[in-house]
Amino acid sequence: DYKDDDDKLSTSKTIDMELVKRKRIEAIRGQILSKLRLASPPSQGEVPPGPLPEAVLALYNSTRDRVAGESADPEPEPEADYYAKEVTRVLMVDRNNAIYEKTKDISHSIYMFFNTSDIREAVPEPPLLSRAELRLQRLKSSVEQHVELYQKYSNNSWRYLGNRLLTPTDTPEWLSFDVTGVVRQWLNQGDGIQGFRFSAHCSCDSKDNKLHVEINGISPKRRGDLGTIHDMNRPFLLLMATPLERAQHLHSSRHRR
Amino acid sequence: DYKDDDDKLSTSKTIDMELVKRKRIEAIRGQILSKLRLASPPSQGEVPPGPLPEAVLALYNSTRDRVAGESADPEPEPEADYYAKEVTRVLMVDRNNAIYEKTKDISHSIYMFFNTSDIREAVPEPPLLSRAELRLQRLKSSVEQHVELYQKYSNNSWRYLGNRLLTPTDTPEWLSFDVTGVVRQWLNQGDGIQGFRFSAHCSCDSKDNKLHVEINGISPKRRGDLGTIHDMNRPFLLLMATPLERAQHLHSSRHRR
Amino acid sequence: ALDTNYCFSSTEKNCCVRQLYIDFRKDLGWKWIHEPKGYHANFCLGPCPYIWSLDTQYSKVLALYNQHNPGASASPCCVPQALEPLPIVYYVGRKPKVEQLSNMIVRSCKCS
Amino acid sequence: ALDTNYCFSSTEKNCCVRQLYIDFRKDLGWKWIHEPKGYHANFCLGPCPYIWSLDTQYSKVLALYNQHNPGASASPCCVPQALEPLPIVYYVGRKPKVEQLSNMIVRSCKCS
């Protein structure tokens, strides 16, 4: 970390590039095991033969797609975030559920409800959750629209979470909203149904407040298409959490060196 | 950057802390001059005697306050951002100007207009601008309100820029909005009057859409108070830009080593 | 920036991001990571010269601060600037898991 | 985090942020910066041990990766993590200028 003065212009020193690569590879071996809190590679004895299940591949692809769109300038990494996060997804409550009845004639918004017991199954304790994203697949659209996301708050009130300007698109497109704080709070409450509202941004002079965005698995004109409603493309929560068994280790002394 | 293997656990090496400090101080000497593109410290021969002008101190304090509230996790720094930025401010067009006439009976919004020739005087060329902030001093308030900022777009249309949840406050409080893109756009256009609208967040079911926030130097009930209107606390643009004479150097080869 | 676009297409001797693809099976002897089969880890390498200076050298040195010692370190080091995460799929017993590992891919470097 | 809160109140031998106040007049012999009179620049110092390992050492080494080599560098270095800007006031001729210098104050360090 501190070198001799004569090292200032050490371009003359020849670098054994292969040695540096070998060191980097060995360091990565340790890094991956350490991030997964494994002392050695896991045994493959019980791994079922054949390809990975489709649901697992879909989840892997969701995560990979998210990474590709993510800023490459990470926040400084708190200790807990150094370790690997298990990725799971929780689909929204099926559109045929009676809970959607009251919302179906509202033109400025669409609604998505989630069962907190499903979320708790994936993330048993609030502090284990490191990120939650609401992911919606927007169908192709030729209009631009400013939209907003709200959280169901109490009986008839909604809390503003964020907004997005959606530009026209020729292909279906995944939208992602960070809802970590909301899901953490749901985990801090009893089980039940919680929800989000996805709305047009309404202007103060109330002209056209209709939501022109269609979301896969939700938009009214597709409600009869059960193929779409039941597939993996309906809105879901992508959850990243420290697995329970890994959490215990996080509390050993931080600076014990 | 790459050390011998025996250096891996180099805790045994004694560090001359004083030497490291001296090196760091010398490096900072070079860093500051380099960021200001000075080959040597500027001559102080013409500096007027006495304390700094009050307007300069106010500007320095505005900048210092902004730094204190700023995230300490910077983005990776593009080359142009390495160099020092001159800080100036441009006050909004005086409230007595006829341009405000049409806006004074609108309860959901307040309006702030700026003369682009004043902005161009501070930043002669669009690429020189590295950051522009709209700063408003909000007066004390016991209510919470969700507010939005818009940019005047064409004759009667407004473009959404951002929003903020304003919590109650016992003391006046500065609000700051990043409007770099907007001001850069203005600099790319001809001279004229351009403006912002600061509005209540209006709900789709239009209940109370009145703006309950009072802004120093703007809010209607204070319009007669010229002391407040003309002081340094009325809305202004805080501009950070590369001085013209320094900009010439930025176009030498990036990686000439 | 000393990023993959610049560094992979130049013969920069000083601090830059260097190409390194890791194949889990070939390089680490691991068969337990089912997806991906490998990844572009990359790494930072190269000196950060002109680390500090005496007045006499200013004219030569000042122009080089920006790249070689922007943080005015007593002894600058070539380190990652932008990093990206890596999702993986592996099995624990019979159960497949998707996990995300933070800060695994080096996209750019800096003298710090 | 290896930040001022932790490092200034401990006797950490490894990588940490170290206190350094620079008085422009006393330390640099400069009278031309009118505001501020000086600033807490700080700096990063200390080794990042356990930089890479062979299989035999894993049990000992893995728990230390988090602090000592989180980025799996071939040779980790103690460098700034969080930085803050510094505004200054100085004169060019008769004209006072307020300028902001980016990334001047070290708030925390990391092994990178």
Partner: antibody, heavy 117, light 110 residues
Framework: QSLEESGGDLVKPGASLTLTCTAS????????MSWVRQAPGKGLEYIGM??????TYYASWAKGRFTISKTSSTTVTLQVTSLTAADTATYFC?????????????WGPGTLVTVSS | AYDMTQTPASVEVAVGGTVTIKCQAS??????LAWYQQKPGQPPKLLIY???DLASGVPSRFKGSGSGTRYTLTISGVQCDDAATYYC????????????FGGGTEVVVK
């Protein structure tokens, strides 16, 4: 429903101590529990907490010297080792407001620990 | 680390007046914030959770607001009984913290 802390005492520097929190009218099996301390004339300081299923979480300064455990469905303990004068405080135990929460709706009256030679 | 900074440290208010206490988190805590009241010789009492939800039995003159990193507790129509020290607590992060509580604000009622 109530909580009561016990085990506070005058102890010498370097000693260890175990504080106990006992519940009446409810069981810990469906609540998070935490320990918080308050030095004389000072603010509240979070020490750590234990979840419904027994996972423990600690403040960074408390790791290693403080241990929280559930010893039965109605008692939770806090063990402190290597006590110093800086540990002199009233120690509170607190229960989550609702079953899964880690904000604290029910508090005990506190037990005073004094460390002095 | 997630640090909570509370301001002011102390405030004086007349009966019937309004008092505003601010709490700033060093990072976004997504509204996962609670407020407590503590009187001398007593344990703290939960007033508000999730930034603005009133705990049961708490009078409506206590109002919480805010999001992201900035939160506010407002007490309107202050009564003598409101003289106490008030603390904010983040419950977003439980392990990467030195203290989940803010430093406290003493409210003196005149």
């Amino acid at each position: 429903q109530s909580l009561e802390e016990s085990g506070g005492d005058l102890v010498k520097p370097g000693a260890s101590l175990t504080l106990t929190c006992t519940a009446s009218g409810f069981s810990f099996s469906s609540y998070w529990m935490s320990w918080v301390r308050q030095a004389p004339g000072k603010g509240l300081e979070y020490i750590g907490m234990i979840s419904i299923i027994g996972t423990t979480y600690y403040a960074s300064w408390a790791k290693g010297r403080f241990t929280i455990s559930k010893t039965s469905s109605t008692t939770v303990t806090l063990q402190v080792t290597s006590l110093t004068a800086a540990d002199t405080a009233t120690y509170f135990c607190a229960r989550g407001y609702v079953s899964n929460s880690n904000y604290w709706g029910l508090w005990g009256p506190g037990t005073l620990v004094t460390v002095s030679s | 680390a997630y640090d909570m900074t509370q301001t002011p440290a102390s405030v004086e208010v007349a009966v019937g007046g309004t008092v505003t206490i601010k709490c700033q988190a060093s990072q976004n805590i997504g509204s996962n914030l609670a407020w407590y009241q503590q009187k001398p010789g007593q344990p703290p009492k939960l007033l508000i959770y999730y930034a603005s939800d009133l705990a049961s039995g708490v009078p409506s003159r206590f109002k919480g607001s805010g999001s992201g990193t900035r939160y506010t507790l407002t007490i309107s129509g202050v009564q003598c009984d409101d003289a106490a020290t008030y603390y904010c607590q983040q419950y977003w992060s439980s392990s990467n913290v030195d203290n989940t509580f803010g430093g406290g604000t003493e409210v003196v009622v005149k």
